[in-house]
Every structure is written in structure tokens, then in C-alpha cells.
């Protein structure tokens, strides 16, 4: 079945009067960018920049677009078929066990360790023991133990954004 392009799929400046276009479901499902009507007879388009759906679905409502927190940058905006993509600002990263916030990367490794990996939006700097080459996954070292890899004081272990 051919993809249905509705007014809601267009950028806001391209849209005419606000009006949710409808089409018919295919085997009880509506295409990405739409949700199903209460009676199951229509597919109603999501609202551009407000909500979305990514798959063929029988959802009564489209999903709300994510809004990037302060401390995050928007890599790509929300469309009717794709959620917003947010990324931690430079110098911060998001851990798997605390995905709700970006934490500041450490500025250096503890004494006796060398940096083998840079700060990325997904990971802190990576440190290994000079001799053994084993990774260090401990807490941020005390100031006097830190060997900074750049000027300035070590970062605090946690930075709450938003």
C-alpha cells in the first residue's frame, strides 16, 4: 500500500488550516505517523512536532514527542513518524544505569592510570592501569589523586540537568 502523505506530515509552515487528515486502516492497523480512531474505521494523522508513531499500529493516541532536557542538544526534531533525538552536551555523557540525566565526564584519570578513551555523549573517559592495562571503573578520585588531562579542576561526579 502506498504511503499516505497528509498535511500533518508537512512542516508547520507548509501546512494549511489545522485539520487532521484521515485514511482507512489496513487489516486493523494504521501506518506510521497515524493512530486509529475509536471506532476503528479511520487512521488519523499525528500532530507534527507534538506527537508521533513509528510503526503500523492500532494505538488510540499518538505518542508524545520527547523534549530535550537542558544539558542536551537536539540532534533531530520530532516528526510524525520519528521521535526527537537528544544527545548529551559536549563534556557530559549518559550512563545506561541513569539514562534520565547527563553526567559530567571526568577531566582526568587517577594516579598510575592513563586515558585510553575520550569523553563521548555515551561514555565517560576510559582509564587503564599503566602496567596491567586493566580498566578502572571506580568512583571519581579525590582531587589530590587526580592527574588532569586538561587544565582546570576535576569535574564533579554528578550533574543534574533540568
Amino acid at each position: 500500500e502506498s504511503a499516505l502523505i497528509t498535511q500533518q506530515d508537512l512542516a508547520p509552515q507548509q501546512r494549511a488550516a489545522p485539520q487532521q487528515k484521515r485514511s482507512s486502516p489496513s487489516e486493523g492497523l494504521c501506518p506510521p505517523g497515524h493512530h486509529i480512531s475509536e471506532d476503528g474505521r479511520d487512521c488519523i494523522s499525528c500532530k507534527y512536532g507534538q506527537d508521533y508513531s513509528t510503526h503500523w499500529n492500532d494505538l488510540l493516541f499518538c505518542l508524545r514527542c520527547t523534549r530535550c532536557d537542558s544539558g542536551e542538544v537536539e540532534l533531530s526534531p520530532c516528526t510524525t513518524t520519528r521521535n526527537t533525538v537528544c544527545q548529551c552536551e559536549e563534556g557530559t555523557f549518559r550512563e545506561e544505569d541513569s539514562p534520565e540525566m547527563c553526567r559530567k565526564c571526568r577531566t582526568g584519570c587517577p594516579r598510575g592510570m592513563v586515558k585510553v578513551g575520550d569523553c563521548t555523549p555515551w561514555s565517560d573517559i576510559e582509564c587503564v592501569h599503566k602496567e596491567s592495562g586493566t580498566k578502572h571503573s571506580g568512583e571519581v578520585p579525590a582531587v589530590e589523586e587526580t592527574v588532569t588531562s586538561s587544565p582546570g579542576t576535576p569535574a564533579s561526579p554528578c550533574s543534574l540537568s533540568g
Partner: nanobody, 127 residues
């Protein structure tokens, strides 16, 4: 985690009105669709009404359409269910529930998709 707390239940005469409230708290609570469900003694829990994250889109069970109205405050953290022309058959424990959205199968009693439930509030309608 999203926490849901219902209030406003009570006893009322047939033909009367009652307004239930559901207070949603927790990270991104206002991003969720919220629905009201009810369970009468000896019966399955059933869908009553739901609204999307903004409160702009609403859906009702056929049996309550025209009598019940679901609404959401601007902050998105309180969802109300205004019930009028109440009948003894409306007697049940009313539950608030939240999910990113609800599948249409929820209208037929498929509740597996729901992420969060409140504790419920009792509504009794006497004739």
C-alpha cells in the same frame, strides 16, 4: 516511575453526579496517556474513558458516552472524570491507569499494555 492517586469516590443517588480525580506524579508523568477503568464486584475490569498526553484527544466506552467526561489540566498532571446521570450499574471501584498510549484492544478488555495503575476509589450509586 509514574505514581497515580485517585480521589473523589463516594456514594450518590441514581441520577446524581460525581467527579473523580487522578493525580499523576513522577518523571514525565505528563507525557503519558491516562485512562479510567472500573471493576464491579464479580466482574472483569473494564475500560471507561481515556485521554492522550495533551488532553485534546479523548475516547469513551459506549456505555458511558454522553454521561461521562474526561479532562486533563494544563500541566497534564491531573486527569478528571466527571460522571453525571449515574446509574446503579455504574457502582464499581474506579481505577486510573497510565501508558504511553492505549491500543484499541483496551476497549475489549486487553489491559496487558498498561504500565501503571492507581489504587482505586469506590463509587456507589444507589437507587
Amino acid at each position: 516511575q509514574v505514581q497515580l492517586q485517585e480521589s473523589g469516590g463516594g456514594s450518590v443517588q441514581a441520577g446524581g453526579s460525581l467527579t473523580l480525580s487522578c493525580a499523576a506524579s513522577g518523571r514525565a508523568a505528563s507525557d503519558y496517556a491516562v485512562g479510567w477503568f472500573r471493576q464491579a464486584p464479580g466482574k472483569e475490569r473494564e475500560f471507561v474513558a481515556a485521554c492522550n498526553w495533551s488532553g485534546e484527544d479523548t475516547v469513551y466506552a459506549y456505555i458511558v458516552k454522553g454521561r461521562f467526561t474526561i479532562s486533563r489540566d494544563n500541566a497534564g498532571n491531573t486527569v478528571s472524570l466527571r460522571m453525571s446521570s449515574l446509574e446503579p450499574e455504574d457502582t464499581a471501584v474506579y481505577y486510573c491507569a497510565a501508558a504511553p498510549s492505549f491500543s484499541r484492544s483496551v476497549l475489549d478488555g486487553n489491559l496487558s499494555q498498561i504500565d501503571y495503575w492507581g489504587q482505586g476509589t469506590q463509587v456507589t450509586v444507589s437507587s
